[in-house]
């Protein structure tokens, strides 16, 4: 048995931040689980991890330098990514693993979400007027 995951096909990260919601066909509230977000077609970069255990507080971390936070819903985990760079525009995949109680469960690979990072439009500062000649 595999858990099904739904993600938005595409998100635009304005102001270099985005909320990516991973919706599961599974209730996580009474489980010990590891939800993670992976970057790239080959899911090579683990962007963020949300570790949950029904009796303890959620642990959220990134070992790859991403600024991330996570929120748990009944059948979802939302990743909040900040300080994204334009060159981090890519496809991102949600992954879920139920560690306990057994048996171990994970998800069918989802279609992923393309996150398009739009750079901040910095307004050019007006030219500083030079000293006026008398």
């Amino acid at each position: 048995n595999k858990i099904l995951v739904k993600q938005s096909p595409m998100l635009v990260a304005y102001d270099n931040a985005v909320n990516l919601s991973c919706k599961y066909s599974y209730n996580l509230f009474s489980r010990e689980f590891r939800a993670s977000l992976h970057k790239g077609l080959d899911s090579a970069v683990e962007v963020c991890v949300v570790y949950g255990n029904y009796s303890q507080q959620l642990q959220v971390y990134s070992k790859t330098g991403f600024n991330c936070d996570g929120k748990l819903g009944n059948e979802s985990v939302t990743f909040y990514l900040q300080n994204l760079y334009v060159n981090q525009t890519d496809i991102y995949f949600c992954k879920i693993e139920v560690m306990y109680p057994p048996p171990y469960l994970d998800n069918e690979k989802s279609n992923g979400t393309i996150i398009h990072v739009k750079g901040k439009h910095l307004c050019p500062s007006p030219l500083f007027p030079g000293p006026s000649k008398p």
């Epitope: 509230f29 009474s30 009796s55 109680p101 057994p102 048996p103």
Partner: antibody
């Protein structure tokens, strides 16, 4: 179809031990947790613990630690519960039941027929 | 450990009536609750899982409701075959405690 076949009734002396069995069929034995439940005459159901044959994981109700020991034999798809130091308080019907995972919500949809244990001198 | 308080302990009703059995917990169990029926000399039978989901094959006169710490099993238009013992059980961690049971008798 899923079936849990439990061993027959036992009459045992105080202080003795007994081993009850629960033979599973109709599904992959190593993929499901088996729970054990006690029912004393005139009283309610009492949860003893569970055993997961896939990894030999066990959880006990603290009340039954030292009283019940859960094991399994994968080759015969059987889970065992040994009860030691028996007293009249252990006289009861003992059930095994399979835990199913309904998309993250647990329940016990399949039960054995129960084994009656009578402790008497 | 989670405490399960089931009430009433017993009730005597007539065929055709409606009954409600309640189960209270001392902390939020997020709907991780099942209801069982047990008849004398038989194994328990699962009626409802996840607090509100009726098991396939169980008559629709049985229904479950509730959330948080309070849950109910309702049986409408009671039939003679509905008499017996009813138990709730939580699955919010271990021990997976049962309620004390409700004995449903014919008046």
């Amino acid at each position: 179809q899923v079936k849990l076949q439990q061993s027959g009734a036992e009459l045992v002396k105080p202080g003795a031990s007994v081993r009850l069995s629960c033979k599973a069929s109709g599904y992959t034995f190593t993929e499901y947790i088996i729970h054990w439940i006690k029912l004393r005459s005139g009283q309610g159901l009492e949860w003893i613990g569970w055993f997961y044959p896939g990894s030999n994981d066990i959880q006990y109700n603290a009340k039954f630690k030292g009283k019940a020991t859960l094991t399994a034999d994968k080759s015969s798809s059987t889970v065992y519960m040994e009860l030691t130091g028996l007293t009249s308080e252990d006289s009861a019907v003992y059930f095994c039941a399979r835990r199913d995972d309904f998309s993250g919500y647990d329940a016990l949809p399949y039960w054995g027929q129960g084994t009656m244990v009578t402790v008497s001198s | 450990d989670i405490q399960m308080t089931q009430s009433p302990a017993s009730l005597s009703v007539s065929v055709g009536e409606t009954v409600t059995i309640t189960c209270r917990t001392n902390e939020n169990i997020y709907s991780n609750l099942a209801w069982y029926q047990q008849k004398q000399g038989k194994s328990p039978q699962l009626l409802i899982y996840a607090a509100t989901h009726l098991v396939e094959g169980v008559p629709s006169r049985f229904s479950g409701s509730g959330s948080g710490t309070q849950y109910s099993l309702k049986i409408t238009s009671l039939q003679s075959e509905d008499f017996g013992n009813y138990y709730c059980q939580h699955f919010w961690g271990t021990p997976c405690t049962f309620g004390g049971g409700t004995k449903l008798e014919i008046k």
